[in-house]
C-alpha cells in the first residue's frame, strides 16, 4: 500500500524548489525498478516529481490566500512490468499560512450618531476589520483594535471593534468627532501587521440648554391712541439647541396693571408684547412688566438643565396724544 | 496641542497706544470666538472683549469702549487688541481666551477653555 | 452694570468639602463658569453652564446655581486645590467676573 504523510508547502517561499514530501509504496525496496508519476491540477507547472524517488518538490511561489490546497493523483509503475504497483490515488497538498495579509476595513466610511451628554459605555459602534490570513492558523488572524485618535471620548473593546463613550460630550463644545481605530493580528504581538480606519461620530442634540434673553432689559412705547390688541414691540431669546429643542414659549411673569400681554411667534421664535388694555398718559405714562421664556418641550431627566427661566425687564413708556 | 501665545506687550506712556497680538494654533481658529481678559497686579480677572468667529460682532467693557479695538485675521490665526491712550489703569496681564461653543451658538454659556500664558503692558510716565 | 460677588477668602481641611458662592441679582436664571487661577499661571476652566465638567476636570468639582447664589463645590478637598476661583456670567452680551475667592487648604 501507499505510505502517506500529510503534505505541507509555505505560501511565498522564495526558493526556486521547495521540497514538498514524497510518494512511497511499501512495496519499494529502493533498487529502482519504480517509476513514480504526480497528476491533476498543478501536477508539472507547481510541482514536480522525482520519478525515481518520489519525491515532491513545489517550483512556483504559492499564495495560501489564493489556492490553499492542491488535490493531485499519485502513481508508481513498475518499470520492468510496466503495471501499477499500487491504485491511482489521491492525495492533498496543503500550502501553510503565512502572516502576509493585513486586517483591512471592509465596511468604510463608518459614520455613526449617538446623542450629546450620553453616559460612559454608552454603546457608539462597531468596526469589524477581516485578515485574509489563514484563523485556524497560529495567531496570523487574531486581530486586536486600539485606538489611536479619540481619547478621552471613546474607548474601543479591544477584542470585539465595539466602540464606547469614555466622556461626556457635549455638542455645543463640538458637534462631531473623528475617530481613528488600528487593528492588529498576531494579537498584537512583534512582527503584526495592522490597518487603520476612519469613523465619523456626530451627536446628536439633546435639550441641554435653556433659552436666555440676551438683553436684561427692553424699552418699548406705546401710543395712548393705540387699540387693544396692538403689537407694541418685540422681545428676544436664544436657545443654542437645535430643532424642537429651541422652542421656546414667552409668558408675563409679572403685570400688576394687567395691561400687556406677550405671544410667541413660532415661526421666529420671538415674543410679541401685545397691549391687553388700552392706556393713558395722563392717569399713568410708564410701565414696568418681567416677562420670562421656557422652553416648549422639555424631558424630564433633562429638567436639571431648566431649574430656572430667564426673565427679562421691559419699560414701557406710554406716548402722550393731543386730545381734542 | 490647542495653545494660545500672546505678544506685544511692554512698558508705555500714559496716552499713548499699544497693540497685543494672540498667535492660535492647534485648533480651527475661524470657528470660536475669542475674548481678552485682563489682570492687573494682585487683583481679580476683568473681561476687556471679545470678537466673534467671523468678527461679525465685537463687544467691550464700558472701562474701554472707545479706546480698544479688538481684530483679527483669520487667515494668520492671529487675534488682536489695538489699545488707545492708555491710563494707568490699564496696566495688568493680558490674556487671550477662547469662547467655549460651536459657531451659531451665541453667549458665553460655556466659559473660556483655553488661555493664553499672558503679555503684561505697563502705563507709566 | 451687572456685578457678581464672592467672599474673599474661605478655607478648607484636607480631605473636606469647600464651598465658595458667587452672587448676582437673579443669578440662578443665568449660566455661570467658575475658573481656577494658581499663582503666576492663566487661569483654567473647572465648571460651565452651571454644572458640566469640561474634559479633564475631576468630578470633586460641581456646581449648582439657584435664585441669587451660584456655588461651586469642592468635595475632598486636597493640597493642589489651593487656588484663586471666579465666577463668570454674561449680562447683555458683555461678561462679568466675580472678584474672586482665595481658598486656603489648611495644613
Known amino acids: 500500500g501507499w505510505v502517506w504523510n500529510q503534505f505541507f508547502v509555505p505560501e511565498e517561499m522564495n526558493t526556486t524548489s521547495h521540497h514538498v514530501g514524497r510518494l512511497r509504496s511499501d512495496l519499494d525496496n529502493g533498487n529502482n525498478s519504480f517509476q513514480y508519476k504526480l497528476l491533476g491540477a498543478g501536477a508539472g507547472s507547481t510541482f514536480i516529481i522525482d520519478e525515481r524517488t518520489g519525491d515532491i518538490y513545489a517550483i512556483e511561489k504559492l499564495d495560501r490566500e489564493e489556492r490553499s490546497l492542491y488535490i493531485l493523483r499519485a502513481q508508481v509503475i513498475d518499470i520492468t512490468t510496466g503495471r501499477a504497483v499500487e491504485p491511482e490515488s489521491e492525495f492533498v497538498i496543503k500550502v501553510s499560512d503565512i502572516n502576509d495579509n493585513e486586517p483591512k476595513f471592509l465596511d468604510e466610511p463608518y459614520e455613526a450618531i449617538v446623542p450629546e451628554m450620553s453616559p460612559e459605555g454608552t454603546l457608539v459602534i462597531q468596526v469589524t476589520a477581516s485578515d485574509a490570513d489563514d484563523p485556524s492558523s497560529g495567531n496570523n488572524a487574531r486581530l486586536l483594535y486600539s485606538l489611536l485618535q479619540g481619547q478621552p471620548y471613546f474607548s474601543v473593546e479591544p477584542t470585539t471593534g465595539v466602540i464606547r463613550i469614555s466622556s461626556k460630550m457635549d455638542r455645543e463644545l463640538q458637534d462631531e468627532y473623528w475617530v481613528i481605530i488600528q487593528a492588529k493580528d498576531m494579537i498584537g504581538q512583534p512582527g503584526a501587521l495592522s490597518g487603520t480606519t476612519s469613523v465619523l461620530i456626530k451627536l446628536s442634540d439633546v435639550n441641554d440648554n435653556k433659552p436666555i434673553f440676551k438683553e436684561s432689559l427692553y424699552r418699548l412705547t406705546v401710543s395712548e391712541s393705540a387699540p387693544t390688541g396692538t403689537s407694541i414691540g418685540t422681545i428676544m431669546a436664544y436657545d443654542n439647541d437645535i430643532g424642537e429643542n429651541a422652542e421656546m414659549d414667552y409668558s408675563i411673569e409679572e403685570d400688576d396693571s394687567q395691561t400687556f400681554d406677550i405671544i410667541t411667534n413660532h415661526e421666529t421664535q420671538e415674543g410679541i408684547v401685545i397691549l391687553k388694555k388700552k392706556v393713558n398718559f395722563e392717569h399713568q405714562n410708564h410701565y414696568g412688566i418681567r416677562a420670562k421664556v421656557k422652553n416648549h418641550h422639555v424631558d424630564e431627566q433633562l429638567m436639571k438643565y431648566h431649574t430656572e427661566a430667564s426673565t427679562t425687564f421691559i419699560k414701557i413708556q406710554v406716548e402722550d396724544v393731543d386730545e381734542p | 496641542q490647542v495653545q494660545l501665545v500672546e505678544s506685544g506687550g511692554g512698558v508705555v506712556q500714559p496716552g499713548r497706544s499699544l497693540r497685543l497680538s494672540c498667535a492660535a494654533s492647534?485648533?480651527?481658529?475661524?470657528?470660536?470666538?475669542i475674548h481678552w481678559v485682563r489682570q492687573a497686579p494682585g487683583k481679580g480677572l476683568e473681561w476687556v472683549a471679545v470678537?466673534?468667529?467671523?468678527?461679525?460682532?465685537?463687544y467691550y467693557a464700558d472701562s474701554v469702549k472707545g479706546r480698544f479695538t479688538i481684530s483679527r485675521d483669520n487667515s494668520k490665526n492671529t487675534l488682536y487688541l489695538q489699545m488707545n491712550s492708555l491710563r494707568a489703569e490699564d496696566s495688568a496681564v493680558y490674556y487671550c481666551?477662547?469662547?467655549?461653543?460651536?459657531?451659531?451658538?451665541?453667549?458665553?454659556?460655556?466659559?473660556?477653555?483655553?488661555w493664553g500664558q499672558g503679555t503684561t503692558v505697563t502705563v507709566s510716565s | 452694570s451687572y456685578e457678581l460677588t464672592q467672599p474673599p477668602s474661605v478655607s478648607v481641611s484636607p480631605g473636606q468639602t469647600a464651598s465658595i458662592t458667587c452672587s448676582g441679582d437673579?443669578?440662578?436664571?443665568?449660566?455661570v463658569s467658575w475658573y481656577q487661577q494658581k499663582p503666576g499661571q492663566s487661569p483654567i476652566l473647572v465648571i460651565y453652564?452651571?454644572?458640566k465638567w469640561p474634559s479633564g476636570i475631576p468630578e470633586r468639582f460641581s456646581g449648582s446655581n439657584s435664585g441669587n447664589t451660584a456655588t461651586l463645590t469642592i468635595s475632598g478637598t486636597q493640597a493642589m486645590d489651593e487656588a484663586d476661583y471666579y465666577c463668570?456670567?454674561?449680562?447683555?452680551?458683555?461678561?462679568?467676573f466675580g472678584g474672586g475667592t482665595k481658598l486656603t487648604v489648611l495644613s
Open positions: 481666551a477662547r469662547r467655549a461653543g460651536i459657531p451659531g451658538t451665541t453667549g458665553y454659556y460655556y466659559g473660556m477653555d483655553v
Open positions: 492647534g485648533f480651527t481658529f475661524s470657528r470660536y470666538g
Open positions: 470678537i466673534w468667529y467671523d468678527g461679525s460682532n465685537k
Open positions: 437673579r443669578l440662578g436664571e443665568k449660566y
Open positions: 453652564q452651571d454644572n
Open positions: 463668570q456670567a454674561w449680562d447683555s452680551s458683555t461678561v462679568v
